[in-house]
Amino acid sequence: IWELKKDVYVVELDWYPDAPGEMVVLTCDTPEEDGITWTLDQSSEVLGSGKTLTIQVKEFGDAGQYTCHKGGEVLSHSLLLLHKKEDGIWSTDILKDQKEPKNKTFLRCEAKNYSGRFTCWWLTTISTDLTFSVKSSRGSSDPQGVTCGAATLSAERVRGDNKEYEYSVECQEDSACPAAEESLPIEVMVDAVHKLKYENYTSSFFIRDIIKPDPPKNLQLKPLKNSRQVEVSWEYPDTWSTPHSYFSLTFCVQVQGKSKREKKDRVFTDKTSATVICRKNASISVRAQDRYYSSSWSEWASVPCS
Amino acid sequence: RNLPVATPDPGMFPCLHHSQNLLRAVSNMLQKARQTLEFYPCTSEEIDHEDITKDKTSTVEACLPLELTKNESCLNSRETSFITNGSCLASRKTSFMMALCLSSIYEDLKMYQVEFKTMNAKLLMDPKRQIFLDQNMLAVIDELMQALNFNSETVPQKSSLEEPDFYKTKIKLCILLHAFRIRAVTIDRVMSYLNAS
């Protein structure tokens, strides 16, 4: 058993039917010695008397808010949450596995640049009685500071019969140098509590591996005289690290017909312009990627050919 | 990915082309190592990230773009003191810091070259003959060093009398390639920045 926060405790249980459970001793936070009784949640049934209460915790019915009283007055509370260990693996019932880029990916994180700012998000089908708390650091043995905001509900979507809820959090490394070569990963820890169930999720990554630039901006077409060709031009996104000659991007330019089945023409360039043939009803899209370290491509920025 | 390869203009900063080749070569070698050593801990998540140049060179600090020198987090250890002149500085008014930067890059390359050659000698003794260093990568390191053209003491190749542990050597190869790839990215960024300056 360990303390999650004041008066909130997590009991770690080997979780299988008929498992022996854990014996827990609760102590009433009071100088009083006599006439103390204990109750659980809203029930008035007295579970025991005395300054300490010993309980065998085996299932969720044994968890909840234990209260010690004296003569009708509440002395203190202890909320017991359960953390299930199924066959030696901590349970992951609260969050959905996003399965990208691999199984058991519960947290996904992205950074728009090398400033040390990043966003993480996760999914759940649970809509009520749910709280999250997020901590982060650079490295784990001698952790360096990363400050995270509060997790917020950022999207809701319907998936088949279920509603899916997306939560996200923004974090910022306290003293980040964009040019630094990372040797210690960023660690992100999310505590999730649903009713009386506690779970924790972690992700470990280097900022360089989660870079996903914003799409190129100011995408423009300039028709070339006496030709079906156009000059496409664009700019680095505002959110990208500077100077751009050091933090260079490479670009992919795509000409896509109206029909998804039509052949796509693609050109790769390090410049911020390209000459392409603009077909009728086609659209031109450009996306960006770090020129030197192949992390994710940005989303496409698009303009119609007409 | 199949990006078109840029061919440098004759007047272009002479080292840019070599640094691009270096990054391509080390990335290919790392990919080959990951595939060949699939049952070894060779991915970025599995390895310890060690930098063999730590406390010996300070390329990141010495080569920091001017725009980032205002960022205090980037200025924690700028006390290296290499100074010399190399051919990459040809016909340019170069600052002390630029000379320091290129000299630091040269020292990095020299250290990695020694490590890779020592490791290759061990890998050639492996009866499994599972993986060897790409000669192209070693050649590209050499070419960039020559382009930098710094006068420096030659570091003798390490030789070991004990029987090599091939498992450990292959894991060390992965660690070294990951670190060298990160340094090659920095070198490429620096050369691109200097070329634009």
Epitope: P17, D87, G88, D93 | -
Partner: antibody
Framework: EVQLVESGGGLVQPGGSLRLSCAAS????????MVWVRQAPGKGLEWVGS????????YYADTVKGRFTISRDDSKNSLYLQMNSLKTEDTAVYYC?????WGQGTTVTVSS | DIQMTQSPSSLSASVGDRVTITCKAS??????VAWYQQKPEKAPKSLIY???HRYSGVPSRFSGSGSGTDFTLTISSLQPEDFATYYC?????????FGGGTKVEIK
């Protein structure tokens, strides 16, 4: 007493469908993840798929992905395995399990 | 996918013998390994989880050990009811995979 009882097995033609059920009792079913495991005649054990408590996470073996669907109805203390596009190689005894408890198994035969 | 290679595939032993079955994972699986016992025409029985933890009710003569890639199930003194087929399983990553089984027969 903890019990897991499978049902719904039988003979089916290739390409056909079958729905297996597993009735659980003796424990708080909704609080536990469940698995399906199968065993072809004379062969070893093969994991088919798993479902977490609350159905938030469901995983399948590559051999059945896209053809089999695992679901649960906590109000009925029941686990299900919907099997579509059955192949002869799906012939096996199917067990539902929640360590350390296993059902007795139900036999599925896919044959023309 | 992680392969679990069990050895031997079969062995003959006498009552009272100490029996050791090994299982090798193709990749590091930590301690996320379970062992099962199965008798002909019966459902498997769970013995060990987390490489070395016995489920309640499993006799103490069964013990498991190992971590990473090498795991062992030991029966310290073979009893008549222990003649069966034993399977190891990794549950470190999906898909979950079983070893091919070890048949323990009477000598």
């Amino acid at each position: 007493e903890v019990q897991l009882v499978e049902s719904g097995g039988g003979l089916v033609q290739p390409g056909g469908s079958l729905r297996l059920s597993c009735a659980a009792s003796g424990f708080t079913f909704s609080d536990y993840g469940m698995v399906w495991v199968r065993q072809a005649p004379g062969k070893g054990l093969e994991w088919v798929g798993s479902i977490s408590s609350g159905s938030s996470n469901i995983y399948y073996a590559d051999t059945v992905k896209g053809r089999f669907t695992i679901s649960r109805d906590d109000s009925k203390n029941s686990l299900y395995l919907q099997m579509n596009s059955l192949k002869t190689e799906d012939t096996a005894v199917y067990y539902c399990a929640r360590n350390p408890y296993w059902g007795q198994g139900t036999t599925v035969t896919v044959s023309s | 996918d992680i392969q679990m290679t069990q050895s031997p595939s079969s062995l003959s032993a006498s009552v009272g013998d100490r029996v050791t079955i090994t299982c090798k994972a193709s990749q590091n699986v930590g301690t996320n390994v379970a062992w099962y016992q199965q008798k002909p025409e019966k459902a498997p029985k769970s013995l060990i989880y987390s490489a070395s933890h016995r489920y309640s009710g499993v006799p103490s003569r069964f013990s498991g050990s190992g971590s990473g890639t090498d795991f062992t199930l030991t029966i310290s003194s073979l009893q008549p009811e222990d003649f069966a087929t034993y399977y190891c399983q990794q549950y470190n990553s999906y898909p979950l995979t079983f070893g091919g089984g070890t048949k323990v027969e009477i000598k």
